[in-house]
Interface confidence: low
Amino acid sequence: EICGPGIDIRNDYQQLKRLENCTVIEGYLHILLISKAEDYRSYRFPKLTVITEYLLLFRVAGLESLGDLFPNLTVIRGWKLFYNYALVIFEMTNLKDIGLYNLRNITRGAIRIEKNADLCYLSTVDWSLILDAVSNNYIVGNKPPKECGDLCPGTMEEKPMCEKTTINNEYNYRCWTTNRCQKMCPSTCGKRACTENNECCHPECLGSCSAPDNDTACVACRHYYYAGVCVPACPPNTYRFEGWRCVDRDFCANILSAESSDSEGFVIHDGECMQECPSGFIRNGSQSMYCIPCEGPCPKVCEEEKKTKTIDSVTSAQMLQGCTIFKGNLLINIRRGNNIASELENFMGLIEVVTGYVKIRHSHALVSLSFLKNLRLILGEEQLEGNYSFYVLDNQNLQQLWDWDHRNLTIKAGKMYFAFNPKLCVSEIYRMEEVTGTKGRQSKGDINTRNNGERASCESDVLHFTSTTTSKNRIIITWHRYRPPDYRDLISFTVYYKEAPFKNVTEYDGQDACGSNSWNMVDVDLPPNKDVEPGILLHGLKPWTQYAVYVKAVTLTMVENDHIRGAKSEILYIRTNASVPSIPLDVLSASNSSSQLIVKWNPPSLPNGNLSYYIVRWQRQPQDGYLYRHNYCSKDKIPIRKYADGTIDIEEVTENPKTEVCGGEKGPCCACPKTEAEKQAEKEEAEYRKVFENFLHNSIFVPRPE
């Protein structure tokens, strides 16, 4: 039975029964977040031979080996990967060996085996026999090999049963467990797989086979599987599917996309049954299963469920890649970014029509709107309050709208509004009125002749804060209601805030002509009640962190000696409250006598306050039965047992200081200080670990169904 389109087993180990009849998992297999240690011995899935995507194991308590669960898992194809990996074993607290003794091939992708405190038999597996390239494998933070005492079958009795290969200049026996060797095929087979009896399989077999030189006896196929036979290519009238098998047209027609109920069905293109047409192609009619090349950019209608799509980063712009018609409103709010104009052009440059309104505000990174290089029509079917369909507010570096000599843009309905664009000439706005056909629609205040194109700005009134309240991740501030001569001229307030370890920031920190801006900005509307003081709750802040905050009043033009009059506050420095620290790092214990343990650790990465003390708890554990499976007498010494710290291997506490040559003198002394390059490499390594862990958590933690 083919199972799919991906199996996620979590929380309850009995869900494993879903794998009972699976021979191939078409998709991924996740086994994760089973926190109660269970006895897995009664669970065995000998039918499972192939996983077409990847295998992910994460925090499964009580599972000591995968060999009993998946004794015949032979191939992980890696058709789709989990963060570049086809096999991920992460934070498996009780796993003692991988034990996948029949795993012969990982077709694509690398492996990541990390933070498995009790995991051994890693140095005894030659991954180069399973993967094409081992350079991207990441095996870190598991039990140190010298504490494992890994012994391959027969070594103790001096009758070794396993074959040897060289890894890192070390020629040694290769095995998965104490009683399972790593299978190697005779050199005469070359790249071909072999049977248990070392007979070479058919060239189209992958991993293994039940009979030699027979393309119907393969455990898995090198290329494609069709009607019981491994074939180099799919036969006529069949189509490649999911990277491993051939299906007919009817099968493809009735596949329903697992991702969305709103998508059209699968298509057949270039001999493959796929979810949608590839780039540069479009369906030949909405019901069609076939793709035709687009003339020019492919028409693509994109719709935002919430009606308004906010573009505040390259990531959000990415969602519009390839869109030619945008059904909804665009709110562009780009405050910073590297190479932002070309990135935005890449993702938004094909948009021709926006059915609603376009609003550009606080986009200090923008110098021009030319990234919307194909925009020709704003329908204005939905408008902002005041009947605006093109609204440009507070863009500090905006100098050009479009090149009007080469641009034909129509605004079908609605007015334009321009304010607080100090580098945008009013003549440029008037030109846009003419080109877009909106001349005569705007009223006098819609195009502000004083604060558009006016670099100089004289803010003379001071806003005073009236209260501040903090919690561990929130700051509430209020300030005096600013009362300009004409109360109607006050539009709103903008609060600027950022982390400030030292009290030395200025309003213009990190802001330059390229649009870099280190301040976060929040708009605050006026309280409806004129007697209520305005305020804001800033949330999502870091505990025990000092922030700088200031507020600006957003006002209409008030002429006073030919200057724009406004108001802003001084910069206020305020610290959030302390919180619970993150866990101490690199916990390490060793015994220096029969009645003592020495425990060491590093401070938490996020102290979230001033640390005053640590609490150490311990309890007696039953003797680990796994110890008795090894004959440690055959080793030179019995290693001191410790649990891996889950990050990197650290030397024993009890060892003597290293003897190294330092500063030209010989003799015992401390290790030489790390070079800048080493420090940088360590920093990048730590960063890489963090990025992967975040990716893992974001991928697998989902809200519990209500």
């Epitope: 027609a253 009735n254 329903l256 697992a258 109920s261 709103d262 998508s263 059209e264 069905g265 009619g285 909405s286 019901q287 069609s288």
Partner: antibody, heavy 121, light 107 residues
């Protein structure tokens, strides 16, 4: 205005044949599949299958293989359901329904008013 | 085939009431659950697709929720025109299957 207009009620004897029509208007007929749904008196709805209006290729649910046939008259934007060798249990109201959003019709956003077929000797 | 069960075949409520109609699938249908309204004259129309998405033109007093195998349709403020039979339908796996229907009446 998007609508599906079905033919009127029909009274037939067992063993006879009935052909129900469903005329589409207000949208491109060949862009969206046509589904057929049966509702026996006092019973729930039962999906019979669909026809690809682009290719004319029908797909039948297991219970409706054999005596039932879907066909098209594309020039008239009309789909047909024909039931041969009528039985008493074919007495029901038959709806045509089109999914204007999804090729295989995970949901049907346009429905005909239904055609009641009565089979009685 | 996936069986769809509407345990309540008929339901009486007063105008202005909040009414909830439930539907259960025999297996996980991954939110591919749609709701239809059949008026006494026999006409059928789509109300909600993909568990909670309101079809265009449907009043906002209708809402849907659920996940896995259990789903429900809620009418927040019952009006006279809502008197009808309501069917659920799964769109996860062919053949599409409908629930037995829940007939809504006025007390």
């Amino acid at each position: 205005q998007i609508q599906l207009v079905q033919s009127g009620p029909d009274l037939k004897k067992p063993g006879e044949t009935v052909k129900i029509s469903c005329k589409a208007s207000g949208y491109t007929f060949t862009n969206h599949g046509m589904n057929w749904v049966k509702q026996a008196p006092g019973k729930d709805l039962k999906w019979m299958g669909w026809i690809n209006t682009n290719t004319g290729e029908p797909t039948y649910a297991d219970d409706f293989k054999g005596r039932f046939a879907f066909s098209l008259e594309t020039s008239a934007s009309t789909a047909y359901l024909q039931i041969n060798n009528l039985k008493n249990e074919d007495t029901a109201t038959y709806f045509c329904a089109s999914p204007l959003y999804y090729r295989n019709g995970r949901y049907f956003d346009v429905w005909g008013a239904g055609t009641t077929v009565t089979v009685s000797s | 085939d996936i069986q769809m069960t509407q345990t309540t075949s008929s339901l009486s409520a007063s105008l202005g009431d909040r009414v909830t109609i439930s539907c259960r699938a025999s297996q996980d249908i991954s939110n591919y659950l749609n709701w239809y309204q059949q008026k006494p004259d026999g006409s059928v129309k789509l109300l909600i697709y993909y568990t909670s998405r309101l079809h265009s033109g449907v009043p906002s007093r209708f809402s849907g929720s659920g996940s896995g195998t259990d789903y429900s349709l809620t009418i927040s403020n019952l009006e006279q025109e809502d008197i009808a039979t309501y069917f659920c339908q799964q769109g996860k796996t062919l053949p599409w299957t409908f629930g037995g229907g829940t007939k809504l009446e006025i007390k």
